[in-house]
């Protein structure tokens, strides 16, 4: 004969656990039904009564099976700085994430507590590093024979251009400008291409890159806010 | 409004039994959920539990006192009654009666009735 | 059975004062924890149910918190009329009181 199935509420067997969805009540010594996701007990089982559930109210939330007295409260509304990518319902929490243009200083469990707007690199300084979701932008100085002319945060070093008569030579912070005849750009083998951070909608369709000719000085700057002789700026 | 008052004897002699009726209004011991309890306070000491009833006839008991207690429920009347046997002075205390939420905290309390046990 | 140790068992403020008491249980009682307040001669009175949760009409001063074993009651800036004795009540597992905090003013 097949074991008979039981219904909540149940004693389980000595050293058994209870069932998928059923918690073990330490009152009743019993196996009870979890209430499902959206729900929370109102009234907790008995050893003849099983849990009674009831919806969560609104901007409350239960995410898992559970047996809780009262659902979760929903994290407050997203802040200017960010976009609701989850909204709270009774099943999940709400989720804000930082809009483009800016990083997560401050993550917490799910989403955002704190974002920050992406270091923008000064002109004569180019992007090392490109923000992400959860990291800002680092600049470094434009080595000799690069340079970029943008307060931003997606812009390289790009080469200078390569005149066949210079009129003005290129310094970090402006490209060289050639006589009349047309300039031919120089080309380094192998460079790599920087790609564009996830947190912003700038659309860089051929970021140049840097020049193997010189020798390179560049650093990198740290991730903390830099003064503007450092070549960044918090705009 | 909830309201709960207890009632039974000031004065039990050792060894007696003492029955105790709690009177309550507002809720029922028929809905779903709906539980009354009883706790004591012996003079200047803490409060402890004692027994309660759920609204199916389920009951509950103080592990260390199980065997002096029985509570029994008249759903008609609005009444629980806890009887609790062999009384000694020690059992000397204020006795409340209280409901208990679906999620088994105590919310709503009766005002209490002083139970003396001396021969 | 649960026990809860419930400290100090009483203790002397100013009025303004924040006031803290805590319960410690034997054993995990997954948040299930209540707060009374019972003045001299009176039944004790729900102030707080599941850790944190504030019973209707009950003054935003006083406030609770914990996990697992541990729990913190706290009164943000100690009345005159909140003079009484405080209980903690676990009802995890059963239901036990804790021994009581009693609070008076300096």
């Known amino acids: 004969l097949p074991a008979q199935v039981a219904f909540t509420p149940y004693a389980p067997e000595p050293g058994s656990t209870c069932r998928l969805r059923e918690y073990y009540d330490q009152t009743a010594q019993m196996c009870c039904s979890k209430c499902s996701p959206g729900q929370h007990a109102k009234v907790f089982c008995t050893k003849t009564s099983d849990t009674v559930c009831d919806s969560c109210e609104d901007s409350t939330y239960t995410q898992l099976w559970n047996w809780v007295p009262e659902c979760l409260s929903c994290g407050s509304r997203c802040s200017s700085d960010q976009v609701e990518t989850q909204a709270c319902t009774r099943e999940q929490n709400r989720i804000c994430t930082c809009r483009p243009g800016w990083y997560c200083a401050l993550s917490k469990q799910e989403g955002c507590r704190l974002c920050a707007p992406l270091r923008k690199c000064r002109p004569g300084f180019g992007v090392a590093r490109p923000g992400t979701e959860t990291s800002d932008v680092v600049c470094k100085p434009c080595a000799p024979g690069t340079f970029s002319n943008t307060t931003s945060s997606t812009d390289i070093c790009r080469p200078h251009q390569i005149c066949n008569v210079v009129a003005i030579p290129g310094n970090a912070s402006m490209d060289a400008v050639c006589t009349s005849t047309s300039p031919t750009r120089s080309m380094a083998p192998g460079a790599v291409h920087l790609p564009q951070p996830v947190s912003t909608r700038s659309q860089h369709t051929q970021p140049t890159p840097e020049p193997s000719t010189a020798p390179s000085t560049s650093f990198l700057l740290p991730m903390g806010p830099s003064p503007p002789a450092e070549g960044s700026t918090g705009d | 409004q909830v309201t709960l008052k207890e009632s039974g004897p000031a004065l039990v002699k050792p060894t007696q039994t003492l029955t105790l009726t709690c009177t309550f209004s507002?809720?029922?011991?028929?809905?779903?959920?709906?539980?009354v309890g009883w706790i004591r306070q012996p003079p200047g000491k803490a409060l402890e539990w004692l027994a309660h009833?759920?609204?199916?006839?389920?009951?509950f008991y103080n592990p260390s006192l199980k065997s002096r207690l029985t509570i029994s429920k008249d759903t008609s009347k609005n009444q629980v009654v806890l009887t609790m046997t062999n009384m000694d002075p020690v059992d000397t205390a204020t006795y409340y009666c209280?409901?208990?939420?679906?999620?088994?905290?105590?919310?709503?309390w009766g005002q209490g009735t002083t139970v003396t046990v001396s021969s | 059975d649960v026990q809860m140790t419930q400290s100090p068992s009483s203790l002397s403020a100013s009025v303004g004062d924040r006031v803290t008491i805590t319960c410690k249980a034997s054993?995990?009682?997954?948040?299930?924890i209540a707060w009374y307040q019972q003045k001299p001669g009176k039944a004790p009175k729900l102030l707080i149910h599941?850790?944190?949760t504030l019973q209707p009409g009950i003054p935003s001063r006083f406030s609770g918190s914990g996990s697992g074993r541990d729990y913190t009651f706290t009164i943000s800036s100690l009345q005159p009329e909140d003079i009484a004795t405080y209980y903690c009540?676990?009802?995890?597992?059963?239901?036990?009181f804790g021994g009581g905090t009693k609070v008076e003013i300096k």
């Open positions: 209280a409901r208990l939420t679906g999620t088994r905290y105590f919310d709503y």
């Open positions: 507002g809720f029922s011991l028929s809905t779903s959920g709906m539980g």
């Open positions: 009833i759920w609204w199916d006839d389920d009951k």
């Open positions: 054993q995990d009682i997954n948040k299930f």
């Open positions: 599941y850790t944190s």
């Open positions: 009540l676990q009802y995890g597992n059963l239901w036990t």
